[in-house]
């Protein structure tokens, strides 16, 4: 028979011969022939490979540096590699969660759209009409302005995007 | 071209050890295992095991397990066999062999085992 | 240890004739990969053996193809369509899907 040009899924062409590659988990240790199969090692541990390969290395698992403000969100396996987060109040500067930094926090006349998560910046917006924030915080959202009217009082001095309404009683010397 | 290249006869005494060698080229040393293979005098071939020499990791006939060291020296691209507590049995021309990408042996040592 | 008994022992032929030798193994050849590991492999006086088939069927580089091999399982032959003058010899079969990997006494084919 004519060797191969191409191989199956999961396979891979070396020396006019399909090989079966090692599963995720396990490292090459030697080509198959026309006498043997693929030999595969189990990665060793604080080691991983998580697709059908014929890699000689497996890859380290990450490190979750506290130093950076990291700590492992999910633990890595011979499949795997370790999943880092920030510890509260800190967010990853990228995908990969290489470093954290603090969580931003919104000023005065901006509110919390969407708190932040470990992964994720916290996500300001400026407060409507109708609404304020009188302080620089990652979990205030916009409050409403108070409703005078509610409470049988009367707007003594008008509400902006960093403060409240001010209510006062009614003027009762009016007709 | 892929080439084995063997030791010379060896000529031992009973409960004695031997140490054949076998030096690789022409092609990249640890990319393939070195198997070891011997044929007594008009008899058949019989397996002692296997070494790869990226690792050092070895697979043996249990029936040698005990007397043969299988080694490598990748720094000289060479194989060692080493057979101890020899017996008259031993008597034999032994062959490392190479396998993928077709299959290669050793000219064969003699290993004359006599007292 | 997989038993490899090839038959006959001894296979005298006439030139140009074919020739046949028979491999069995005491268990199925049969890798859990889908490959039967069963080979075939030409001893000259004198020489190192020489491999001549790998895998039941598969001829190595250089080998003439009056040589073909077949069988599955434990059943294996090695046939030489027309024999010549240089195919004088001992022929082996092998298995290396279990280990030890073990081999057949031998065929020793002469011209008569």
């Known amino acids: 028979p004519e060797p191969p040009t191409a191989c199956r899924e999961k396979q891979y062409l070396i020396n006019s011969q399909c090989c079966s590659l090692c599963q995720p988990g396990q490292k090459l240790v030697s080509d198959c022939t026309e006498f043997t199969e693929t030999e595969c090692l189990p990665c060793g541990e604080s080691e991983f490979l998580d697709t059908w390969n014929r890699e000689t290395h497996c890859h380290q698992h990450k490190y979750c540096d506290p130093n950076l403000g990291l700590r492992v969100q999910q633990k890595g396996t011979s499949e795997t590699d370790t999943i880092c987060t920030c510890e509260e109040g800190w967010h990853c500067t990228s995908e990969a969660c290489e470093s954290c930094v603090l969580h931003r926090s919104c000023s005065p006349g901006f509110g919390v759209k969407q708190i932040a998560t470990g992964v994720s910046d916290t996500i300001c917006e400026p407060c409507p009409v109708g609404f304020f924030s009188n302080v620089s915080s990652a979990f205030e959202k916009c409050h409403p302005w108070t409703s005078c009217e509610t409470k049988d009082l009367v707007v003594q001095q008008a509400g902006t995007n960093k403060t409240d309404v001010v209510c006062g009683p009614q003027d009762r010397l009016r007709a | 071209q892929v080439q084995l290249v063997q030791s010379g006869a060896e000529v031992k005494k009973p409960g004695a050890s031997v140490k054949v060698s076998c030096k690789a080229s022409?092609?990249?040393?640890?990319?393939?295992?070195i198997y070891w293979v011997r044929q007594a005098p008009g008899q058949g071939l019989e397996w002692i095991g296997g070494?790869?020499?990226?690792?050092?990791?070895?697979n043996f006939n249990e029936k040698f397990k005990s007397r043969a060291t299988l080694t490598v020296d990748t720094s000289i691209s060479t194989a060692y066999m080493e057979l101890s507590r020899l017996r008259s049995e031993d008597t034999a021309v032994y062959y490392c062999?190479?396998?993928?990408?077709?299959?290669?042996w050793g000219q064969g040592t003699t290993v004359t085992v006599s007292s | 240890d997989v038993v490899m008994t090839q038959s006959p022992l001894s296979l005298p032929v006439t030139l140009g004739q074919p020739a046949s030798i028979s491999c069995r193994s005491s268990?199925?050849?049969?890798?859990?990969?889908?490959?039967?590991?069963l080979h075939w492999y030409q001893q000259r006086p004198g020489q190192s053996p020489n491999h001549l088939i790998y895998?039941?069927?598969n001829r190595f580089s250089g080998v003439p193809d009056r040589f073909s091999g077949s069988g599955s399982g434990t059943d294996f032959t090695l046939k030489i369509s027309r024999v010549e003058a240089e195919d004088v010899g001992v022929y082996f079969c092998?298995?290396?899907?279990?280990?030890?990997?073990?081999f057949g006494g031998g065929t020793k084919v002469e011209i008569k």
């Open positions: 268990q199925s050849l049969l890798h859990s990969n889908g490959n039967t590991y």
């Open positions: 092998s298995q290396t899907t279990h280990v030890p990997w073990t």
């Open positions: 895998q039941v069927s």
């Open positions: 022409g092609y990249t040393f640890i990319s393939y295992y």
């Open positions: 062999t190479r396998h993928g990408n077709g299959v290669y």
């Open positions: 070494i790869n020499p990226r690792n050092g990791g070895t």
